[in-house]
Interface confidence: low
C-alpha cells in the first residue's frame, strides 16, 4: 500500500518522494533496502536524502532497487517503500511503455498537458516540449508554467508528449525528461436540425448535354459524433438506387468532415453523359438526422454554348 514506483533515465536527475507523508518537522530516514544501508544526507553525495525527498543527481542504472523511508515523529514511525528503476537512454525516438507517465485526455475546451513530477524539482521556466521526439513549434503550442496548452485541439494532436527541464541543485544543473500520452476526446456533442449548405434551395444548375455533371449535397448536423446523420439524393422523389438510371449514381460512402467543429456530410451525385430528359427531373438533396429531414431541390438547365462571333 505504501510503496511507490519511480523511474528515470541514467545521467538525468531523479527525485523521489517518500510515499508516507508527515509534517515537515518530522525526520525522515532513508535506507537502501537490499543492504539496509543508510542514505547520506550530505549534498556532496550523488545520491542523498533531503527530508521526504530522495535525490539522484544524476541517476545511474546501478541505483535501481527498493529504498525504504521511515517517517519518525515523537509518537510513531511510518514506513514507506520507493521502488526505483533507472533505465539506459534509448538511442531511437520511441519511448517505451515503462517510461510513460499516466495518459491524459484533452478536448477542444481543455487541452492542458501537465509535465509529470515537475513539482518535485527546482526548475525555472521555460519548459521545452516535444511530441514524438519533435520539438513543438507554432503558435498553437504554449508552454505555460508547468503545463503545455494546445489551441484548437484536433485528433491529430494525440500522441506522446515529452517535457524537458533543468533541475538546479546548489548551482549545478541536471536535465530531466518525462513523457506521457495525450488522447483527444470529443467534446460533449450536440445535434441540430440539419442545415444544408449546398445546394441552395431551388438552385438551377447549368449543364452541357453530352458532358458529365456533378451535384454535391452538403449538410451539417451539430457538433461532435452524430448518432445518426445522412445525406442522400432523390430523383423525382425516388431513391437513386430505386430510380434505375445507371448513368446517375451517388458517390459511395459519405465523407464526414469537421468544419469549425461541426459534423458535416457530403454526397456527390454523378450524372454521366447528360441527356435532355435529365433536365426534366427534380433533384432533391436530403439531409436527415433524428431531429428531422430537410430537403433542397435542384433543377438542371441547358448551358448555352459560348458564341465565338467576332
Amino acid at each position: 500500500k505504501f510503496s511507490k514506483q519511480s523511474w528515470g533515465l541514467e545521467n538525468e536527475a531523479l527525485i523521489v518522494r517518500c510515499p508516507r507523508q508527515g509534517k515537515p518537522s518530522y525526520t525522515v530516514d532513508w535506507y537502501y533496502s537490499q543492504t539496509n544501508k543508510s542514505i547520506p544526507t550530505q549534498e556532496r553525495n550523488r545520491v542523498f536524502a533531503s527530508g521526504q525527498l530522495l535525490k539522484f543527481l544524476p541517476a545511474a542504472v546501478a541505483d535501481s532497487g527498493i529504498y525504504t523511508c521511515i517517517v519518525r515523529s515523537p509518537t510513531f514511525n511510518r514506513t514507506g517503500y520507493a521502488n526505483v528503476t533507472i533505465y539506459k537512454k534509448q538511442s531511437d525516438c520511441n519511448v517505451p511503455d515503462y517510461l510513460m507517465y499516466s495518459t491524459v485526455s484533452g478536448s477542444e475546451k481543455n487541452s492542458k498537458i501537465y509535465c509529470p513530477t515537475i513539482d518535485l524539482y527546482n526548475w525555472t521556466a521555460p519548459l521545452e516540449w516535444f511530441k514524438n521526439c519533435q520539438a513543438l513549434q507554432g503558435s498553437r503550442y504554449r508552454a505555460h508554467k508547468s503545463f503545455l496548452v494546445i489551441d484548437n485541439v484536433m485528433t491529430e494532436d494525440a500522441g506522446d508528449y515529452t517535457c524537458k527541464f533543468i533541475h538546479n541543485e546548489n548551482g549545478a544543473n541536471y536535465s530531466v525528461t518525462a513523457t506521457r500520452s495525450f488522447t483527444v476526446k470529443d467534446e460533449q456533442g450536440f445535434s441540430l436540425f440539419p442545415v444544408i449548405g449546398a445546394p441552395a434551395q431551388n438552385e438551377i444548375k447549368e449543364v452541357e448535354i453530352g458532358k458529365n455533371a456533378n451535384l454535391t449535397c452538403s449538410a451539417c448536423f451539430g457538433k461532435g459524433t452524430q448518432f445518426l446523420a445522412a445525406v442522400l439524393w432523390q430523383l423525382n422523389g425516388t431513391k437513386i438506387t430505386d430510380f434505375g438510371e445507371p448513368r446517375i449514381q451517388q458517390e459511395e460512402g459519405q465523407n464526414q468532415s469537421f468544419s469549425n467543429g461541426l459534423a458535416c456530410l457530403d454526397m456527390v451525385l454523378r450524372i454521366a453523359d447528360v441527356k435532355e430528359e435529365d433536365l426534366l427531373l427534380q433533384y432533391d438533396c436530403l439531409a436527415l438526422n433524428l431531429h428531422g429531414l430537410r430537403r433542397h431541390t435542384v433543377r438542371l438547365s441547358r448551358k448555352n454554348p459560348i458564341d465565338h462571333h467576332s
Epitope: 445535434s191 436540425f193 436527415l288 428531422g292
Partner: nanobody, 117 residues
Framework: EVQLVESGGGLVQPGGSLRLSCAAS????????MGWFRQAPGKEREFVAG???????HYADSVKGRFTISADNSKNTAYLQMNSLKPEDTAVYYC???????????WGQGTLVTVSS
C-alpha cells in the same frame, strides 16, 4: 419529455425473427423522430434505424434488407421488425426519440436481444 419502454427482446436462433416495440407516453410520437440503437458488450452504442414523422426511414448498412422500422401513431408505439437475425445482432436494443426543437435524445431502458444456437 417522452417516456419510452422497450419490449420484445429475448433469445432467438440464427435466422429467426423478433419484433421489438417501443411504447411512448407523455407525448405523441408523431411529434418526434424515432430511432433504434443497439449496444453490444464492450462496444459503443450504434444507430440501427430511424423513422421520421413523414414516414421516411433510414437504416444502418448492417441491417438493410433484414430490419424494418415502423410507427403506429394511434398506439403511440414504434416497432423494429428484425428478420434473418445473426449472432452479431446480439446487443441491448434502445429506443430513442427526439423532437425538432430539442438537442437531446430521450432514451428507453433497453431490451436484450440474444442470437444464439
Amino acid at each position: 419529455e417522452v417516456q419510452l419502454v422497450e419490449s420484445g427482446g429475448g433469445l432467438v436462433q440464427p435466422g429467426g425473427s423478433l419484433r421489438l416495440s417501443c411504447a411512448a407516453s407523455g407525448r405523441s410520437i408523431s411529434d418526434y423522430t424515432m430511432g433504434w440503437f443497439r449496444q453490444a458488450p464492450g462496444k459503443e452504442r450504434e444507430f440501427v434505424a430511424g423513422i421520421w414523422s413523414g414516414g421516411y426511414t433510414h437504416y444502418a448498412d448492417s441491417v438493410k434488407g433484414r430490419f424494418t422500422i415502423s410507427a403506429d401513431n394511434s398506439k403511440n408505439t414504434a416497432y423494429l421488425q428484425m428478420n434473418s437475425l445473426k449472432p452479431e445482432d446480439t446487443a441491448v436494443y434502445y429506443c430513442a426519440a427526439v423532437s425538432s426543437n430539442s438537442e437531446t435524445f430521450d432514451w428507453g431502458q433497453g431490451t436484450l436481444v440474444t442470437v444464439s444456437s
